[in-house]
Each structure stands twice: as structure tokens, then as C-alpha cells.
Interface confidence: low
Amino acid sequence: GQFRVIGPRHPIRALVGDEVELPCRISPGKNATGMEVGWYRPPFSRVVHLYRNGKDQDGDQAPEYRGRTELLKDAIGEGKVTLRIRNVRFSDEGGFTCFFRDHSYQEEAAMELKVEDPFYWVSPG
């Protein structure tokens, strides 16, 4: 059946060196265990993380994300996943696209990551 892919509506913010989580889900919710799920970075479709055939695939992963990503699949049975990126870099700032592919049917959602310098970050108050 068809579905929509939903990501965060507002930019997600992270500090350099921290880890960040990018959530993504399908609606209506359904079991996505057997689907292909991934994140890539436009405009050159650099693969950030790919989950296929029930396991993470590092073979197409862009080298700058090697060892830095983890797909949190606790709720994949409900069609919800989260991409965790560790050791955030300034070069991670910008657009990410999350996609779900069920056989030949694919939908995706765009999201944005803002990366800030911790030395210029001041907590309010």
C-alpha cells in the first residue's frame, strides 16, 4: 500500500562534536522491517546510511559517514526510525533526505541539520 514519509518540520540543531538524531516515519504507520530505509544527502545522493534486507549496508555509504551513523530501529515495526550521527562535523550541516522503499514504491522526506560551534553557543539565562 501507499504511504507518506514524514520528517521533522523544523531544522534540527546540533553542536560540533556532539551526536544528533534525525527522526523519520511513514504514515499511516506500518511495519517497515522488510522495507529499504535510508538517508542520503542531496544534490549528489551521497549515502549517509542504508538499511536493506533486514540489516545495515555500509557498502554504498559515503566515507565521511563511515563509523559515525546508527539506525535506531526500536519502533521500525510501527514505521518509525531515527538516524543517529555521532561526532557531528560542520560539513554535516545542510539537507538530508530520508526514504522508505517498499518493493518499487518509494517515498521520501527532506530535513535540515544546523551545526553550531559550541564555543559560540551560550545557554539562555
Partner: antibody
């Protein structure tokens, strides 16, 4: 130990065709994107084509687009490059390489000579 | 296409020398820069990926730096087995492109 072994090179006339093969071993072939890179005699390296793990995404250099086709057979751990309408400027050593953005292992290469 | 320009095209050095090769991209490529070593009649070998990350098994005398458009490969103490041709490669955009190479020869 990762090994990539190319074959299929040789002498061919302009306008002719060749099919290169690359037999892979020592790693899970189906989990990695693969590429072809070539090197004309005495010249530098030129990326030719890349194919994703399942073969559902392919990309080509403009110089070969429409003439070359990259493919793979994961059941045989083999990468292919079908080269049609060959030109003199396609003369080169063709290397298969593991990876899509960064080529961490290379085969020894196979020489393709296009000449009449 | 992004053009990659290496300098020098060739250099002569002695064992123990510190050698620096530079690579310039025609537009910013962030840190998407790899370095390869190639010996005559052999396939290239990956040394450095993502500008500064040492490939597994590569001696620590090799190092890479830079981001944006300017990059450097440094060999801290040249060894006899390091005499070869070195290529940079950008992997920021398709098509991936290589520099013309830098040949390191024995003085």
C-alpha cells in the same frame, strides 16, 4: 584478503565491442558498490562508471555515456563493463575498484587497445 | 566538472626527506579528497580518504590535510618504497575527478 581480478581486455577495432569482467573475492561483494577506473598509456586516472550494491543505481563519465554499460552479478561475485562503439581514445588499462566514492581496493587491470 | 590540479608535477627527493604535494580543486569540495599511490605497472593504492583519514595499513609517515579547495599530502620521512606517482581525487561530485599526478623520483 581482498582480490579483484579483471579479464576480457584485448585488441579491438574502432567501432567494436568488448566485455570486461572483474571477479571479486575476500569480501562480501553484494554489500559494496563497485566502479571502473581507466588509465590511458602514460596518462593519469579517469573514473569511468559506478554501480550500487544491487545494481539499481549506475552512473557514467560523459566520455562513455551511452556506449558503456556497467552491471554486476552478485551470485557470481562478478562486475562487468560492456563497451560498445569503441574509439581510439578508449585505449587504456581498465581497473575495477571496490567502492563508489573512495576506491579502497583495485584490481591489477586489463589492457584494452582500440586500433585498426 | 571539478578540475583537480596537483603541484609539482614531479619532484626529486632523497630518503629521509620531508615531501609535500599539493592539490587544488577548481571549486570547494569540503573534505571530499582522497590520495592514492601508484607504482609503475601496478594498480593505485588508497593512502588517505576524506582529506585526512589514514587508510588501514598505511604507514603513519603519510598524512593529509586541507579542506575547501586546497589540500596537502605529506610524507614525513621519505622511504625507498615511497618513490611512486601520487594522485589526488575529489569525491564531492559526479563525475569523480583525479589530479594529473605527482611523480616522486630519487634525487
Amino acid at each position: 584478503e581482498v582480490q579483484l581480478l579483471e579479464s576480457g581486455g584485448g585488441l579491438v577495432q574502432p567501432g567494436g565491442s568488448l566485455r570486461l569482467s572483474c571477479a571479486a573475492s575476500g569480501f562480501t561483494f553484494s554489500s559494496y558498490a563497485m566502479s571502473w577506473v581507466r588509465q590511458a598509456p602514460g596518462k593519469g586516472l579517469e573514473w569511468v562508471s559506478t554501480i550500487s550494491t544491487y545494481g539499481d543505481y549506475t552512473t557514467y563519465a560523459d566520455s562513455v555515456k551511452g556506449r558503456f554499460t556497467i552491471s554486476r552479478d552478485n551470485s557470481k561475485n562478478t562486475l562487468y563493463l560492456q563497451m560498445n562503439s569503441l574509439r581510439a581514445e578508449d585505449t587504456a588499462v581498465y581497473y575495477c575498484a571496490k567502492g563508489s566514492y573512495t576506491f579502497d581496493y583495485w584490481g591489477q587491470g586489463t589492457l584494452v587497445t582500440v586500433s585498426s | 566538472d571539478i578540475q583537480m590540479t596537483q603541484s609539482p608535477s614531479s619532484l626529486s627527493a632523497s630518503v629521509g626527506d620531508r615531501v609535500t604535494i599539493t592539490c587544488r580543486a577548481s571549486q570547494s569540495i569540503s573534505s571530499y579528497l582522497n590520495w592514492y599511490q601508484q607504482k609503475p605497472g601496478k594498480a593505485p593504492k588508497l593512502l588517505i580518504y576524506s582529506a585526512s583519514y589514514l587508510q588501514s595499513g598505511v604507514p603513519s609517515r603519510f598524512s593529509g590535510s586541507g579542506s575547501g579547495t586546497d589540500f596537502t599530502l605529506t610524507i614525513s620521512s621519505l622511504q625507498p618504497e615511497d618513490f611512486a606517482t601520487y594522485y589526488c581525487q575529489q569525491s564531492n561530485a559526479t563525475p569523480s575527478t583525479f589530479g594529473q599526478g605527482t611523480k616522486v623520483e630519487i634525487k
